[in-house]
């Protein structure tokens, strides 16, 4: 049966918690990604940013999970207007910011 949206969001949050807690060396070798506007369309915007990181097994599950939340196909090099212009941050900071935002969405009952 299909997973309820609240369960899917909680699973994504738990995966991001795992990443932040299990982080020993710099996440994805300190790779930089485009910062995004954490408002509408956050899942696709996050995927558009993280999909440009390759060869980083730590975030592969997150990339797959975000893909399930984003209704359209996302490929590397593709950016929406949700990107914060010319601002790049480390993947570790990106994941932390995304985690805070998604936990707030969960608390507010915004699952889609």
């Amino acid at each position: 049966s299909p997973v309820p949206p609240s369960t899917a969001l909680k699973e994504l949050i738990e995966e991001l918690v795992n990443i932040t807690q299990n982080q020993k060396a710099p996440l994805c070798n300190g790779s930089m990604v485009w910062s995004i506007n954490l408002t509408a369309g956050v899942y696709c915007a996050a995927l558009e940013s993280l999909i440009n990181v390759s060869g980083c097994s730590a975030i592969e599950k997150t990339q797959r999970m975000l893909n399930g939340f984003c209704p359209h196909k996302v490929s590397a090099g593709q950016f929406s207007s949700l990107r914060v212009r010319d601002t790049k941050i480390e993947v570790a900071q990106f994941v932390k910011d995304l985690l805070v935002h998604l936990k707030k969405l969960f608390r507010e009952g915004q699952f889609n």
Partner: antibody, heavy 120, light 112 residues
């Protein structure tokens, strides 16, 4: 350590406005919510509203809508609550409180309270 | 709005004796994410409120184990197994599942 420090007591005339501040330290204000709760003498605690300092998303109790404005200055790690068109029944202790930083399940830290007296 | 109704409003207790406070909500306070955000706060004379119990039955860190919470749906209870002199104050139940968030009217616990 985590602290919420509020501005001092105020005495206002009916019809005036009051703005109470709540300065956060020991944590990043953007990582949580800041709520405002008041308590009139001998009355129950009353939730007024809350702000998400990360994106300025605000929710109010409709009872106060139009009279209360919650704002924040993230660079100063401070939240504000302004109440306008004051009347005598607004005499109360006003508290700020933060939602705990993990799943935002409860209020784990409170300010010391600010007494606002409305009197002609 | 969800109305929270507490009883009794006044509770005189002999030290060492148990105490129980009831809280009833006017509608279910199960959040759309599946959690029940029902808390109990104690306000000691001249102090800011302090958290005792969250999500119905979880004791906050540092809260003595003589405090316990239970209930579901619309009926909730706070129990103190053996009241101590330091427990005096006003106890509030609080729901944070639905906006506006609402408190019960408070129960004043005093020592006989």
């Amino acid at each position: 350590q985590v602290q919420l420090v509020q501005s001092g007591a105020e005495v206002k005339k009916p019809g005036a406005s009051v703005k109470v501040s709540c300065k956060a330290s020991g944590f990043n204000i953007k990582d949580t919510y800041i709520h405002w709760v008041r308590q009139a003498p001998g009355q129950r605690l009353e939730w007024m509203g809350r702000i998400d300092p990360a994106n300025d998303n605000i929710k109010y109790d409709p009872k106060f809508q139009g009279r209360v404005t919650i704002t924040r200055d993230t660079s100063a790690s401070t939240a504000y609550m302004e109440l306008s068109s004051l009347r005598s029944e607004d005499t109360a202790v006003y508290y700020c409180a933060r939602s705990e930083e993990n799943w935002y399940d409860f209020f784990d830290y409170w300010g010391q309270g600010t007494l606002v007296t409305v009197s002609s | 709005d969800v109305v929270m109704t507490q009883s009794p409003l006044s509770l005189p207790v002999t030290p060492g004796e148990p105490a129980s406070i009831s809280c009833r909500s006017s509608q279910s306070i199960v959040h759309s994410n599946g959690n029940t955000y029902l808390e109990w706060y104690l306000q000691k004379p001249g102090q800011s409120p302090q958290l005792l119990i969250y999500k119905v039955s979880n004791r906050f860190s540092g809260v003595p184990d003589r405090f316990s919470g239970s209930g579901s749906g619309t009926d909730f209870t706070l129990k103190i197994s053996r009241v101590e002199a330091e427990d005096v104050g006003v106890y509030y139940c609080f729901q944070s599942s639905h906006v506006p968030l609402t408190f019960g009217q408070g129960t004043k616990l005093e020592i006989k």
